[in-house]
């Protein structure tokens, strides 16, 4: 299938031109898209091209400005929040980046009602999270790893917790695992539906190892970062969930919510916690061990002022084939009764669905079946639900959006999505308004992404908030490469992949492959999404036939591909790289000699031992921020697949798939390791030791390190990577420059 | 201080048309909607339309659409009522008031111009 | 269109006695939690006054002795004490649906 079809005609060729990684690197062809943030069924607030904050009236069809540009830049806010109230809004400025979705801010509060910053009681600064109750204006916010309430804005704050240290206790906030392979959010508290308690978890990092890197700076001397950072089979941060009555916060304190006694018995995390009412709520625990995951249900005792996690109350779910749920456990969605839940997990065929719980998870009613998955529970109404999967036309790697009426019988099922811009839209998300009134639809391709608005109820299209006119303008004259996503069919296994072919792509020649790889357990990479990168770049103007393949391991396809690589992660992955690769070269269009291989993170672990398999195939390759060793990554990510690094469990494989294993492979294979030194994620350590072990066994090899740069590698160093990069392909390639 | 200044209220015939101005100071005209309210001798008040200044979006109490236009100079920080094909029933005092959209309230009220009309 | 029916249309008080103004509203105004109904003064020859908005928040420089409270159709303005100053004409007005529509008024006078 040709998703994104070149548009040259002869008559138009010479109008047109390539890509060029400037283009890339200027973000030249970047595209928008359009979450409206609401405030109620039919409002939402939309930052508008100049800067002001705008409320917009579905119903009405009228804008109000709630907060002008001037106002905004008077604290050089970035970022705003409004309180449910609508009195007031909180002003975010001095953003200051720490991990990758913790940052520190300064707030100011201002006054919609009298136009005025609120003077008195001012926050401190940097404040580490802040929210407003989800109704009226109370505030809570952390601060020094401490959580703090007001009533009202210009209130004195009281403080709720007292133990909070940096690197030791974690109040409110996540410490580093926990944010960045458990909750994927910078904060750890949550406001009951009404905003009477506040729930809070407190992690206690006082035994965790440091991990300590240089940060060079300008200084004489360079920083020390220290991070509690538990790597595999490492002392874990120890967690407790604390609720708090908010309108009497002094009366009986914080109470603490009691583990399930089959998870508090051994080693355990704390995945997620969700209000139900605001005198239930729903916490989600997980054994170290992560293949069993327990729900459990609280109630609040008026009487003892605690809260009570009855057995009856425990749902577990195990998996005896991987570990339990997907990237992460899946979080319950719950129905009207404030009792029964929506929840994906896997059905007897091994597919992620949606299950109804009612009474216990054995007695579940499976909502939606086939060998595809639901991938999203977005809302949950009195009579719909609307889900997003990969069902329709059996394409893995697409996202569309679907209604199931619960409110009827039998449930009738619908395709909001499926024909609406058939060809440019594919890959969908959704944003709802309260009660589902209204939702947004963001299309991000195969076509140029667009944005819309649509009813609640009658699913028809209300607007266009984004259509990116200036992108589909700015492409008009550009010879964008050709994408394909098929699939193959290797010994009982789907392989789907993306293929991306020069403009001017003719079967009968020969073209260098560049294989993109990342292959990270419950990853995807074939989706049908609309990118103008430097892959597209280096198809376009340089002429590369480009390859992304979803092997053993990845997402959406059911648990026999992802969960084979359970405790033996480095070997099917790459085994299926491989393979797609030879199937490649079958194709005829492939020189064989000029095949590369390319990978980020997991994909720099894959990449290099891809490049270490010592199947001859690729001439060269780049690994960038790899992994290369499991032992060096962090517990809860690299234990969920690979268990523990000690003898009775996984410490074999753990040392067989080590890059360090292989490096006598890199011989014949020219190699760029590529990472930052100040890399909180994937430590500089994995290169460094990849480095060593090739030095000791004496291969050339080809090195770049981004000094102070973390596992992103952005701003210029961004720019330098892809040149580096670029320079690297094209003389291993040898196309000139 | 915010003010808001109505004027070109007056005796006009049946079927005439008339234009009223409101000139506002003490704040910024594109940061807030401006609505127009009417009020008949001895009787309740009656809410016409509302502008977005900043793209110069209306919306209209259908009883007055197609009769009553609300539009806005912005380098003059005026907006305006035009009015058409006018009848005696819309002999008031015509008010504009400054609308707090995230609220959806009138905050700051003209002192009002009256228009009459009359054979 | 909503129709808002105030009563009672008119009221005769004393000045420190305690005075309830409602509204009712021919269908709910509840917009998800909140309720846009405002409350205004009008004194003779001058404009109204904007007393309260979303149901109970005051507005600027209005004193304390006015708050107002309600949702879904019923609404109340009460004047906790009354004052020489409060003899005037109230109106609600809801702007949870267009058109924004007004209440009849009440006329407080004085006893």
């Known amino acids: 299938i040709v998703l994104r079809p070149s548009r040259v005609h002869n008559s138009e060729e010479n109008t047109m031109r390539a890509l060029t990684l400037k283009d890339i690197l200027n973000g030249t062809f970047s595209y928008k898209t359009f979450f409206p943030n609401w405030i109620s069924g039919q409002e939402y607030l939309h930052q508008s091209a100049d800067n002001n904050i705008v409320l917009y009236n579905i119903e009405t069809g009228q804008s109000y400005t709630i907060l002008s540009n001037r106002t905004m830049k008077s604290v050089n806010a970035s970022n705003y929040g409004l309180s449910p109230d609508r009195q007031f809004v909180y002003l975010e400025s001095d953003y200051s980046k720490l991990w990758r979705y913790s940052y520190t801010a300064t707030y100011y509060i201002y006054d919609l009602s009298n136009g005025e910053f609120v003077r008195g009681n001012e926050l401190p600064r940097p404040i580490q999270y802040l929210c407003w109750s989800p109704v009226g204006s109370k505030l809570a916010y952390v601060y020094q790893n401490n959580i703090y309430l007001k009533q009202r804005p210009g209130d004195p704050p009281f403080q709720i917790t007292f133990n909070g240290r940096e690197n030791k206790i974690f109040n409110g906030i996540p410490d580093w695992v926990y944010e960045e392979e458990m909750l994927a959010t910078k904060y750890a508290l949550w406001w009951s539906p009404n905003g009477k308690f506040l729930a809070y978890a407190e992690f206690n990092d006082t035994d965790i190892p440091v991990i300590a890197y240089s940060y060079y700076g300008d200084e004489q001397y360079p920083r020390t970062i220290n991070i509690p950072y538990p790597k595999a089979g490492a002392k874990n941060p120890v967690v407790r969930i604390f609720i708090i009555d908010t309108t009497y916060p002094a009366y009986v304190g914080p109470q603490e919510v009691p583990v399930p006694a089959m998870i508090a018995s051994s080693d355990y995390y704390f995945s997620w916690l969700t209000w139900v009412t605001d005198e239930r709520v729903c916490l989600q625990w997980l054994k170290r061990v992560q293949n069993v995951s327990v729900l459990s249900i609280c109630d609040f005792r008026e009487d003892w002022q605690t809260w009570d996690c009855p057995k009856t109350q425990e749902h577990i779910e195990e998996s005896r084939t991987g570990w339990a749920g997907g990237f992460f456990v899946s979080t319950p969605v719950f129905s009207y009764d404030a009792i029964s839940y929506y929840k994906i997990f896997s059905d007897k065929d091994g597919y992620k669905h949606i299950h109804y719980i009612k009474d216990t998870v054995e007695n579940a009613i499976q909502i939606t079946s086939g060998k595809w998955e639901a991938i999203n529970i977005f809302r949950v109404t009195q009579d719909s639900l609307f889900y997003s999967s990969n069902e329709f036309e059996e394409y893995p790697g697409r996202r569309n959006i679907y209604r199931i009426s619960i409110g009827s019988y039998p449930p009738s099922k619908k395709c909001v999505t499926c024909h609406l811009r058939k060809e440019r839209c594919q890959y969908y998300t959704a944003s709802f308004s309260d009660y589902a009134k209204y939702y947004a639809l963001v299309c991000y391709g195969p076509g140029i992404p667009i944005s819309t608005l649509h009813d609640g109820r009658t699913d028809q299209e209300i607007k266009i908030l984004e259509e990116n006119k200036e992108l589909e303008n700015a492409l008009k004259n550009i010879q964008l490469p050709k994408e394909e996503i098929k699939k193959l069919e290797v010994d009982e296994i789907t392989l789907w992949y993306k293929m991306i072919l020069p403009p001017q792509f003719d079967r009968s020649k020969k073209y260098p492959l560049l294989i993109q790889v990342y292959g990270g357990p419950c990853s995807q990479s074939v989706r049908s999404v609309f990118a103008v990168n430097w892959i597209s770049y280096l198809a376009s103007k340089e002429g590369m036939v480009i390859a992304l393949v979803d092997g053993r391991g990845t997402a959406f396809q059911g648990d026999k591909l992802l969960y084979a690589v359970y405790r033996k992660l480095g070997v099917y992955e790459v085994e299926d790289q491989i393979t797609a690769v030879r199937k490649f070269i079958e194709m005829g269009f492939i020189d064989e000699k000029r095949i590369a291989i390319w990978g980020w993170s997991y994909g720099g672990y894959v990449s290099s031992l891809a490049l270490a398999s010592g199947t001859g195939l690729f001439k060269c390759g780049i690994a960038v921020a790899p992994v290369s060793s499991w032992e060096y990554y962090a517990s809860v990510y690299t234990e969920r697949f690979m268990g523990l690094p000690t003898k009775d469990d996984n410490l074999e494989h753990y040392k067989n798939s080590t890059v360090m294993a292989r490096a006598e492979y890199f011989r014949n294979v020219d190699y760029l390791l590529i990472h930052g030194t100040a890399d909180d994620n994937v430590h500089f350590q994995n290169s460094a030791q990849i480095a060593k072990a090739l030095v000791n066994a004496q291969v050339d090899f080809q090195a770049m390190w981004y000094s102070d740069q973390n596992h992103g590698l952005s701003g210029l160093s961004t720019n330098h990577l892809y040149t580096h990069m670029t320079h690297f392909l094209k003389q291993c390639f040898s196309l000139s420059d | 201080e915010v003010q808001l200044l109505e004027s070109g209220g007056g005796l006009v015939q049946p079927g005439g048309s008339l234009r009223l101005s409101c000139a506002a100071s003490?704040?910024?005209?594109?940061?807030?909607?401006m609505d127009w309210v009417r009020q008949a001798p001895g009787k309740g008040l009656e809410w016409v339309g509302d502008?977005?200044?900043?793209?110069?979006?209306?919306i209209y109490n259908q009883k007055f659409k197609g009769r009553f236009t609300i539009s806005i100079d912005k380098s003059k920080n005026t907006a305006y009522l035009q009015m058409n094909s006018l009848r005696a029933e819309d002999t008031a005092v015509y008010y504009c008031?400054?609308?707090?959209?995230?609220?959806?309230?009138?905050?700051?009220w003209g002192q009002g111009t009256t228009v009459t009309v009359s054979s | 269109d909503i129709q808002m029916t105030q009563s009672p249309s008119s009221l005769s008080a004393s000045v420190g006695d305690r005075v309830t103004i409602t509204c009712r509203a021919s269908?709910?105004?509840?917009?998800?939690?909140?309720?846009?109904i405002n409350w205004f003064q009008q004194k003779p020859g001058q404009p109204p006054k904007l007393l309260i908005y979303?149901?109970?928040n005051r507005g600027s420089g209005v004193p304390s002795r006015f708050s107002g409270s309600g949702s879904g159709t019923d609404f109340t303005l009460t004047i906790s004490s009354l004052q020489p100053e409060d003899f005037a004409m109230y109106f609600c007005?809801?702007?949870?649906?267009?058109?924004?529509?007004f209440g009849g008024g009440t006329k407080v006078e004085i006893k």
């Open positions: 008031t400054r609308f707090r959209g995230i609220h959806y309230a009138m905050d700051y």
């Open positions: 003490g704040y910024t005209l594109t940061d807030y909607n």
């Open positions: 502008i977005y200044p900043n793209t110069g979006g209306t």
């Open positions: 269908e709910s105004v509840d917009n998800y939690g909140l309720s846009f």
């Open positions: 979303g149901t109970s």
């Open positions: 007005q809801q702007s949870n649906e267009v058109p924004y529509t």
